[in-house]
Amino acid sequence: MMTGTIETTGNISAEKGGSIILQCHLSSTTAQVTQVNWEQQDQLLAICNADLGWHISPSFKDRVAPGPGLGLTLQSLTVNDTGEYFCIYHTYPDGTYTGRIFLEVLESSVAEHGARFQIP
């Protein structure tokens, strides 16, 4: 039975040209995290394998930095980066947990972080 929950940074906003950290945290389970995949709609951004390290998709290699931790840093943001991002936790023995983050990249200099929320 899957008992875990993923806490994410929720709905977040950032300035064009700036950077943002995408973070998820898996709690309420003793399952071992073997890998976290970071995806944007239908695109793979990065993979963090607990043992093998990081894979960064070449399409994003100049704008994506691994970490902190299992998180992902997006740099040189553009308005086209606005959208849904998913952290997919591969765990043993539970299986897969998915968290969702919505990022809005703003033209203006006023970019405030939204509230944190949980996805079961």
């Epitope: 793979l44 993979i47 607990a50 070449p58 399409s59």
Partner: antibody, heavy 119, light 107 residues
């Protein structure tokens, strides 16, 4: 230039163990993960697992967990794959390969080590 | 485990032909796919990474495409040195798995 040089062919009896070495040169050994892939005669490729010399972490194909042990000796830039309780269907060519920087494809391969298991 | 199914398992072609090899994953693997070429008695060589990126030194006649579960390796004009076996590999999740191979033979 990047090189992965493997140890020579081995002939083993069923139930025995084999340890294959892979000597790396031409790159920073601790910066790349070393993987092991095998190929039975006339068959396709099968991933055994990978070892990250930097973190000391290893990932195994469950099929080989408990029989395969991946290690490294950083002082001599050498990776090892030991396979125990050998069976005849372990007869194969065993390759070591290096994963690319921040990528999970295998960009350089050793020449292969033939392991024959026969009574 | 994710299964990678290649087709065809073998094909006969002539120098100059356009050759297409397909690889189907048993689940969505996004673009986490590489293609390798292997000649008899030799180790595999990386051709394409992340589904569509040509590896350093690989001739431009080799191209890769696809995303999700369906991937293609294309050789635009087959050369004598291209007769070999080709494998796809997924690294979306462990265990990494390979297709069974496609042998490209001389017609």
């Amino acid at each position: 230039q990047v090189q992965l040089v493997q140890s020579g062919a081995e002939v083993k009896k069923p139930g025995a163990s084999v340890k294959v070495s892979c000597k790396a040169s031409g790159f920073t050994f601790t910066g790349r993960t070393i993987h092991w892939v095998r190929q039975a005669p006339g068959q396709g490729l099968e991933w055994i697992g990978g070892f990250n010399p930097n973190s000391g972490g290893s990932s195994y194909n469950q099929k080989f967990k408990g029989r395969a042990t991946l290690t490294v000796d950083k002082s001599i830039s050498t990776a090892y794959m030991e396979l125990s309780r050998l069976r005849s269907d372990d007869t194969a060519v065993y390759y070591c390969a290096r994963s690319s920087y921040y990528r999970f494809d295998l960009d350089y391969w050793g020449q292969g080590t033939t392991v024959t298991v026969s009574s | 485990d994710i299964q990678m199914t290649q087709s065809p398992s073998s094909l006969s072609a002539s120098v100059g032909d356009r050759v297409t090899i397909t690889c189907k994953a048993s689940q969505d693997v996004k673009t986490a796919v590489a293609w390798y070429q292997q000649k008899p008695g030799k180790a595999p060589k990386l051709l394409i990474y992340s589904a569509s990126f040509r590896y350093t030194g690989v001739p431009s006649r080799f191209s890769g495409s696809g995303s999700g579960a369906d991937f293609t390796l294309t050789i635009s004009s087959l050369q004598p040195e291209d007769f070999a076996t080709y494998y796809c590999q997924q690294h979306y999740t462990t265990p990494w798995t390979f297709g069974q191979g496609t042998k490209v033979e001389i017609k």
